[in-house]
Interface confidence: medium
């Protein structure tokens, strides 16, 4: 399908003018390539009326012209003194009129309505109101005043100051008459209907001294705003419908195959399942406008939108409507990211978010979809640092790989971290992309102590496990703070060797603190990596107490909670005073805790990374 | 539209104290992220402190364990409590407000600055 998009159809009344935008996707070929607008002849063959390399046919000499906007994606074609022989079938492209780069478009003209002298038109979308006014003469201000509807030869009375109404009008009509002095009655309508359209006439009194005034009210169809957009991007539906409806239910809608509107989203809590996870209803502002979001967009959720307002919060005849005809470029320049991202209950997840490449200095944020009424979606972190505490310790925000994509790391999942978030910039909003966890059954693959209790002064290890799979990853430690993980520095990890043949069950990464002080309490991460690419998490947290004992040298989980299937950890633990406490000489052989002295080096912190096999403990 | 004013700059003497305010004229409770920037002449603006709607606290290094950020939602005000100050710490202090509306779109807005001069 050609990714060239317009107005599939475009009517307008002899001697008007015409302005018609074509949209195309704005890759540096594209902008630069020849536009063009043609018609189409019997023959099947397209004649080329206007260029945007100054081509003007014969026919359309000073009245028409191209203007290409290569930073939007948009050429516009504007026909001005328009004839019924403008009618026909045309197309707008790009390149070649042949080469199927294009868009068809149908252009109707009509001849004007034949109207009687001295009459008022008024045009007026469905919907919203008119007023029309109907001048007297003083003579005529006691006598009965009244409008009628020529329907063919004959008139039908709407409504008269006697207090009569026509069924039709019921509740959405009225007549007033002003005070004394002021010669001119007016009809207001309100809600107007298709049906409504049509040649009214004002009447005062009756007989030959009668007042009478024509009005031609024209009751249009909102004309569909054209909205051009990436796959997998976001769009924004803003609908402004007035201050009269401020107070009423609202919703958007999409016209379907039978010409009815199914329901996308209403203030009134429904909302259609193939949108979940992936709109919001923003809330009104005090004027009664609001704005409709949907991200992920999908080549099925093309077609004509309507945003209107009815109490029972779905599109009702006579009620104010705005349009939108939405077409999902498949060209997109937004990448394929996963949709779906699946973790195991206590383990972790890593999340790419594109953003738009050239806006590398905008910031990046996630936040997770609500669904409870309109939804909305709570921000967890940005790319200046965490947002809600309550993700402490299992949540960053990562500016790698860079160049149009961050990376999302949350862990210590539980099911209740199972959901749809947003990725999301202060940039370009056409970027935002939504991402649903799922939690699924198993094991996570990295696996370290519970929390631990670190000795002020003495050394700490902390070892973490990770299976074969891993053996070709980069490894890391890393302390997490509200702003980020800084890895921690890294020894230098032994003959290559040690993973090529991976026959054992798991593989060490350690963690060394020497000596530990106050500021080493915290949270740190183990992780894997891939270049800039990152994979699973485990996370432990550091309680830093002073030495209880002269010369003891223990760790301690803070509560008891070592990881599962932590089998290592769990030889020589002994209870005292309900604080497990596990026995040093594991340690010793674990590399969880070493002597109190220096390591090599001195380095405060490390990481040594080797096989189980290499220290010397039981293998799981 | 919120709009932000910002108060307590002046003179101090190195090792004194000041303590900045920044008032919203709208509630700040929807305002995710509220923070101090600075910028010095001839140098580029800054982050001094942010905290978060959730009370998250991050600090520039070169003014952790000086300064403070607090946030008072009830009277729409985040202040800085700036202790120890440095002549170094001489620049023009603005407050910022990140608004992080449902549908993602993020409007940050600035205030107009107060200046801090500290002398040796």
């Known amino acids: 399908k050609s990714p060239v998009f317009g107005p599939q159809e475009v009517s307008s009344v002899e001697g008007n003018s015409v302005s018609i935008k074509c949209y195309y996707p704005p890759t540096s070929v594209n902008r630069h390539t020849r536009k063009y607008w043609c018609r189409k002849g019997a023959s099947g063959r397209c004649i080329t009326l206007v260029s945007s390399e100054g081509y003007v046919s014969s026919n359309y000499a000073g009245r028409a012209n191209l203007t290409n906007f290569p930073e939007n994606g948009t050429f516009v074609v504007n026909i001005a003194q328009l004839s019924r022989d403008d009618s026909g079938h045309y197309k707008c492209g790009l390149g070649i009129n042949s080469r199927g780069l294009s868009f068809d478009v149908s252009l109707e003209v009509s001849q004007g309505p034949e109207l009687p002298n001295g009459t008022e038109v008024y045009t007026v979308d469905v919907g919203r109101t008119v007023t029309i006014k109907c001048p007297f003469k003083t003579e005529n201000a006691p006598k009965t005043k009244a409008l009628y509807k020529k329907i063919g030869q004959t008139s039908v009375l709407v409504i008269d100051s006697r207090n009569y109404v026509n069924p039709n009008y019921k509740d959405r009509i009225r007549l007033r008459i002003p005070g004394t002095g002021q010669l001119i009655f007016t009809v207001v309508i309100d809600r107007l209907r298709l049906s409504d359209h049509g040649l009214y006439l004002c009447q005062a009194g009756d007989g030959s001294n009668r007042d009478e005034k024509n009005a031609d009210l024209q009751v249009l169809e909102p004309e569909p705003e054209l909205v051009y957009e990436d796959l997998r991007g976001s769009v924004t539906f803003h609908c402004a419908l007035g201050l009269e409806v401020a107070n009423v239910a609202k919703f958007l809608c999409r016209v379907n195959s039978r010409e009815t509107c199914d329901v996308v989203i209403n203030t009134l809590g429904k909302r259609d399942s193939a949108f979940e996870g992936r709109i919001l209803l923003n809330p009104q502002d005090k004027d009664g406008s609001f704005s409709v979001v949907i991200t992920g967009l999908r080549k099925e959720d093309e077609g004509r939108y309507l945003c209107g307002a009815h109490s029972d919060g779905q599109l009702q005849e006579g009620w104010p409507i705005q349009a939108w005809q939405l077409f999902v470029n498949e060209e997109s320049t937004i990448p394929r990211s996963p949709t779906v991202v699946k973790g195991v209950a206590g383990g972790s997840v890593a999340v790419l978010c594109p953003y738009n490449p050239k806006e590398s200095q905008s910031l990046k944020y996630w936040c997770l979809w609500e669904g409870a009424q309109n939804g909305r979606c709570p921000l967890l972190v940005e790319s200046q640092g965490l947002v809600q505490e309550q993700y402490e310790g299992r949540l960053s925000l990562l500016q790698e790989p860079g160049n149009g994509t961050f990376t999302v790391i949350l862990n210590q999942l539980t099911t209740q971290d199972a959901g749809f978030y947003w990725c999301l910039t202060n940039g370009d909003t056409r970027w935002r992309t939504t991402v649903e966890i799922k939690i699924i059954e198993g094991e996570p693959n990295l696996k370290v102590p519970g929390n631990v209790t670190a000795v002020l002064g003495e050394t700490l290890n902390i070892p973490c496990h990770f299976p074969c799979k891993f053996s070709s990853y980069e490894k890391y430690w890393c302390k997490w703070s509200n702003t980020g993980c800084q890895t921690l520095p890294s020894q230098d990890e032994g003959p290559s060797e040690a993973f090529v043949n991976c026959d054992e069950n798991s593989r060490l990464v350690s963690l060394t603190l020497n000596p530990v002080t106050r500021a080493d309490e915290g949270w740190y991460w183990c992780g894997v990596k891939q270049g800039h690419f990152y994979g699973e998490t485990a996370a432990v947290y550091v309680a830093v107490e002073e030495k209880k004992v002269a010369g003891s040298r223990y760790v301690s989980p803070a509560k008891a909670d070592a990881a599962p299937d932590e089998k290592v950890l769990d030889s020589g633990v002994r209870e005292i005073e309900n604080k497990a406490i596990q026995d040093p000489r594991l340690f010793a052989e674990e590399k969880v805790v070493a002597d109190t002295g220096d390591q090599a080096g001195g380095s405060r912190a490390s990481v040594d990374s080797s096989s189980s096999e290499e220290q010397g403990g039981s293998s799981k | 539209e919120v709009q932000l004013v910002e108060s307590g700059g002046g003179l101090v003497k190195a090792e004194g104290s000041l303590r900045l305010s920044c008032v919203a004229s709208?509630?700040?409770?929807?305002?995710?992220?509220m923070g101090w920037y600075r910028q010095a002449p001839g140098k580029e603006r800054e982050l001094v402190a942010r905290?978060?709607?959730?009370?998250?606290?991050h600090y520039a290094e070169s003014v952790e364990g000086r300064f403070t950020i607090s946030r008072d939602n009830a009277k729409n005000t985040v202040h800085l409590q700036m202790n120890g100050l440095k002549p170094e710490d001489t620049a023009a202090y603005y407050c910022?407000?990140?608004?992080?509306?449902?549908?993602?779109?993020?409007?940050?807005?600035w205030g107009q600055g107060t200046l801090v001069t500290v002398s040796s």
């Open positions: 910022k407000a990140d608004v992080f509306a449902s549908s993602g779109h993020v409007t940050t807005y």
């Open positions: 709208t509630s700040i409770a929807s305002i995710n992220v």
């Open positions: 905290i978060s709607g959730g009370g998250i606290t």
